[in-house]
């Protein structure tokens, strides 16, 4: 998977008046990394691992960047003519990626009231607008404003692309993201299903990086894909991930089934608990 840095900023208007302040979150490799603290007007790391990325350096640079981006986005919202009664939001998502072959990608996306209306590839400067008439109108508004604003020249978009990649490389240089491996906690549980059957669920939690193999085996052989149900691999809010896999088996055959887990070059198998013990927890 590529390394990525994702900025997510939101500004609000109420009854046509753009509100002061903004919401901002930054994700590094898909994990919550920074957020803008509106009370303290500072960028704050999200958890210990995020603090470790910059070590003892301050977050002044991040604070300055987010503040500037928030100001720009408020000015953009002020130029949207669609403003009417009630609360409205303009959201900008900017993503840059560095792939294994060292190629890079970056893009920018604008959403109004949660609906995508404008995207730009920051490398080719190519704009994309969804087909809906509302999106077309909003996109025309915003693009006209960005064209008028002397700052938003070709140089500006190249700089946005370059700055994002520079920050991403800076974070990766710390080695924290690249080195980091957190093994999963694995839980196997059972629950009654239809008569004569039980559902067994294998949960892996608190692991990093995201890539994991989790599958049920019968007599040491992996079950077919269509006999298992998988959950998405999702961030758990602590800089790590969680997922699960479940299958239905005949009661009495529990000893034939194991949950197989493979993560960062390590693997382990986990048996189904007997009916009396509901949960078996292990950490390899």
């Amino acid at each position: 998977e590529p390394h990525s840095l994702r900025y997510n900023l939101t500004v609000l208007s109420w009854d046509g008046s753009v509100q002061s302040g903004f919401l901002a979150e930054v994700h590094l490799d898909g994990q919550p990394f920074l957020r803008y603290d509106r009370q303290k007007c500072r960028a704050k790391p999200q958890g210990q691992w995020a603090e470790d990325v910059l070590g003892n350096k301050t977050w002044d640079r991040e604070t300055r960047d987010l503040t500037g981006n928030g100001k720009d986005l408020r000015m953009t919202l002020a130029h949207i003519k669609d403003q009417k009664e009630g609360l409205h939001s303009l959201q900008e998502i900017r993503v840059c990626e560095i792939h294994e072959d060292n190629s890079t990608r970056s893009s920018q996306h604008f959403y109004y009231d949660g609906e995508l209306f404008l995207s730009q590839n920051l490398e080719t400067e190519e704009w994309t607008v969804p087909q809906s008439s509302r999106a077309q109108t909003l996109a025309m508004n915003v693009r006209n404003f960005l064209k008028e604003d002397a700052m938003k020249t070709k140089t500006h978009y190249h700089a946005m692309h370059a700055d994002c990649l520079q920050e991403l490389r800076r974070y990766l240089e710390s080695g924290v993201v690249l080195r980091r491996t957190v093994p999963p906690m694995v839980n196997v549980t059972r629950s009654e299903a239809s008569e004569g059957n039980i559902t067994v669920t294998c949960r892996a939690s608190s692991f990093y990086p995201r890539n994991i193999i989790l599958t049920w085996r019968q007599d040491g052989v992996s079950l077919s894909h269509d006999t298992q149900q998988w959950g998405d691999v999702l961030p758990d809010g602590n800089g790590t991930y969680q997922t699960w896999v479940a299958t239905r088996i005949c009661r009495g055959e529990e000893q034939r089934f194991t949950c197989y887990m493979e993560h960062s070059g390590n693997h382990s198998t986990h048996p189904v608990p007997s009916g009396k013990v509901l949960v078996l927890q292990s950490h390899w």
Partner: nanobody, 120 residues
Framework: QVQLVETGGGLVQPGGSLRLSCAAS????????IGWFRQAPGKEQEGVSC???????YYADSVKGRFTISRDNAKNTVYLQMNSLKPEDTAVYYC??????????????WAQGTQVTVSS
């Protein structure tokens, strides 16, 4: 019967202060975003301020830094503290429920209005 009643309007000199109250009966205000809008003679209605059930506040550009909206759920009342009043703040002020929605000024619950006049 569902009702919103405003009080606190009146005549005040430029630079003076007023506090408007919006009290609800027949329903619980704490579950609603409650806002104030105003209408001056010959002008369009203008949103003034809004407070959500979580306490987030929103203001029109023309009143930012001068007006403060607050709520007292125990008293089922929302307040609008108006400081540094200007002649252009002269209008009939209305409070209404559901001020985050895109047609809140025509929503089901809004009050009869209270006159605010700023003049020397």
């Amino acid at each position: 019967q569902v009702q919103l009643v405003e009080t606190g309007g009146g005549l005040v000199q430029p630079g003076g202060s007023l506090r408007l109250s919006c009290a609800a009966s027949g329903f619980t205000l704490e579950h609603y975003a409650i806002g104030w809008f105003r209408q001056a003679p010959g002008k369009e209605q203008e949103g003034v301020s809004c407070i959500t059930s979580d306490g987030d506040t929103y203001y029109a550009d023309s009143v930012k830094g001068r007006f403060t909206i607050s709520r007292d759920n125990a008293k089922n009342t929302v307040y609008l503290q108006m400081n540094s009043l200007k002649p252009e703040d002269t209008a009939v002020y209305y409070c209404a429920a559901d001020c985050l929605s895109s047609n809140w000024r025509t929503s089901a619950y809004w009050a009869q209005g209270t006159q605010v006049t700023v003049s020397s």
